[in-house]
């Protein structure tokens, strides 16, 4: 009686179980009662990453330099090419199909996490006691100057965008 289900790494065709092609190979012809499945390796810029019965391999992804993409990891017959973005740019999605500029953190915000090829700058508001007076993609919030440690007093309070201004203590005569 013909099978209704096949083992792992097999497929059902013409009422019989044939072996799937291994990753990196495509199907040329199904097995028969007398012959094994015939598979062929994928070409130079092609891949298949699963056990399969595909008659065509997939083309490796093209990392288009006009979009700011470059190859992070070259594809093989079993894996696709992985793209990343040029320095100063990061991917807009996990698939990394285009790139955008790294964001700078505005005054009043500091860098929590520096951008990479796959993630943007993460900014955080400067908490009380800290400030940032520049727009930057790498500067963290700086602590306010401690006037006391310099034997000075606060003449002007600090904000999230400005440091405190220290001045001399009033001398009692």
């Amino acid at each position: 009686e013909p099978p209704t289900a096949c083992r792992e790494k097999q497929y059902l065709i013409n009422s019989q179980c044939c072996s799937l092609c291994q990753p990196g190979q495509k199907l040329v012809s199904d097995c028969t009662e007398f012959t094994e499945t015939e598979c062929l390796p994928c070409g130079e810029s092609e891949f298949l990453d699963t056990w399969n019965r595909e008659t065509h391999c997939h083309q490796h992804k093209y990392c288009d330099p006009n979009l700011g993409l470059r190859v992070q990891q070259k594809g093989t017959s079993e894996t696709d090419t992985i793209c990343t973005c040029e320095e100063g740019w990061h991917c807009t999605s996990e698939a990394c199909e285009s790139c955008v500029l790294h964001r700078s953190c505005s005054p009043g915000f500091g860098v929590k996490q520096i951008a990479t090829g796959v993630s943007d700058t993460i900014c955080e508001p400067c908490p009380v006691g800290f400030f940032s007076n520049v727009s930057s993609a790498f500067e963290k919030c700086h602590p306010w100057t401690s006037c006391e440690t310099k034997d000075l007093v606060v003449q002007q309070a600090g904000t999230n965008k400005t440091d405190v201004v220290c001045g001399p203590q009033d001398r009692l005569r």
């Epitope: 330099p65 006009n66 979009l67 700011g68 040029e86 320095e87 100063g88 740019w89 807009t92 285009s98 790139c99 955008v100 500029l101 790294h102 964001r103 700078s104 700058t121 727009s135 930057s136 993609a137 790498f138 500067e139």
Partner: antibody, heavy 115, light 112 residues
């Protein structure tokens, strides 16, 4: 056909403002980054600034807030707003597509700043 | 800001000559260097990107080399269509959210 076409140049007095346009066809501004590059008469090329596919911008250090790049995705057009123009801003202004290099250029539009 | 020093500023050559133009960056730019050809009244045309990659449709007599701060554009056998001005262009990201695209001063290749 993939192309960029600049317009909006002309004669303007010092201190005046001008908005240049760059109409793109054959590709989308929501996919590609585009820069403005200028060239003074008989001189070399000078980068002005860039707008990325998400609308983020960066400028040359000399711009100092005088110029602003923006875009209208529905019209597939980008703009260069130029304020407080000076004689030294006289140049052909090109828009050019690319991230670290410029693979596609428009024909340019001439801006003359003179009284 | 990054400064690109291109030399020579003018070069006299004949058809069939091997021509070399150099570009020096004021600081390391890895391989972020491209070369353009410009003819009078026309927009620049990309020849080479990433220091040595030939742009689409550009004849193989053009080649680029170098990395870091020293770069070279070579035309192996100068053709009548190659008499033009050539520019190098660097891309540099400072890491501080500052982007710089700097062009060399240009090299005019004229008929000897």
């Amino acid at each position: 056909e993939v192309q960029l076409v600049e317009s909006g140049g002309g004669l303007i007095q010092p201190g005046g403002s001008l908005r240049l346009s760059c109409a793109v066809s054959g590709f989308s501004l929501s996919t590609y980054a585009v820069s403005w590059v200028r060239q003074a008469p008989g001189k070399g090329l000078e980068w002005v600034g860039i707008i990325d596919s998400g609308g983020g911008t960066a400028y040359a250090s000399w711009v100092k807030g005088r110029f602003t790049i923006s875009r209208d995705n529905s019209k597939n057009t980008l703009y260069l707003q130029m304020n407080s123009l000076r004689a030294e801003d006289t140049a052909v202004y090109y828009c050019a597509r690319g991230v670290t290099f410029f693979g596609l250029w428009g024909q340019g539009t001439l801006v003359t700043v003179s009284s | 800001d990054i400064v690109m020093t291109q030399s020579p500023s003018t070069l006299s050559a004949s058809v069939g000559d091997r021509v070399t133009i150099t570009c020096q960056a004021s600081q390391s730019i890895s391989n972020y260097l491209s070369w353009y050809q410009q003819k009078p009244g026309k927009a620049p045309k990309l020849l080479i990107y990433r220091a040595s990659d030939l742009a689409s449709g550009v004849p193989s007599r053009f080649s680029g080399s170098g990395s870091g701060t020293e770069f070279t554009l070579t035309i192996s056998s100068l053709q009548p269509d190659d008499f033009a001005t050539y520019y190098c262009q660097a891309y540099y990201y400072s890491g501080g959210g500052s982007y710089d695209y700097a062009f060399g001063g240009g090299t005019k290749v004229e008929i000897k």
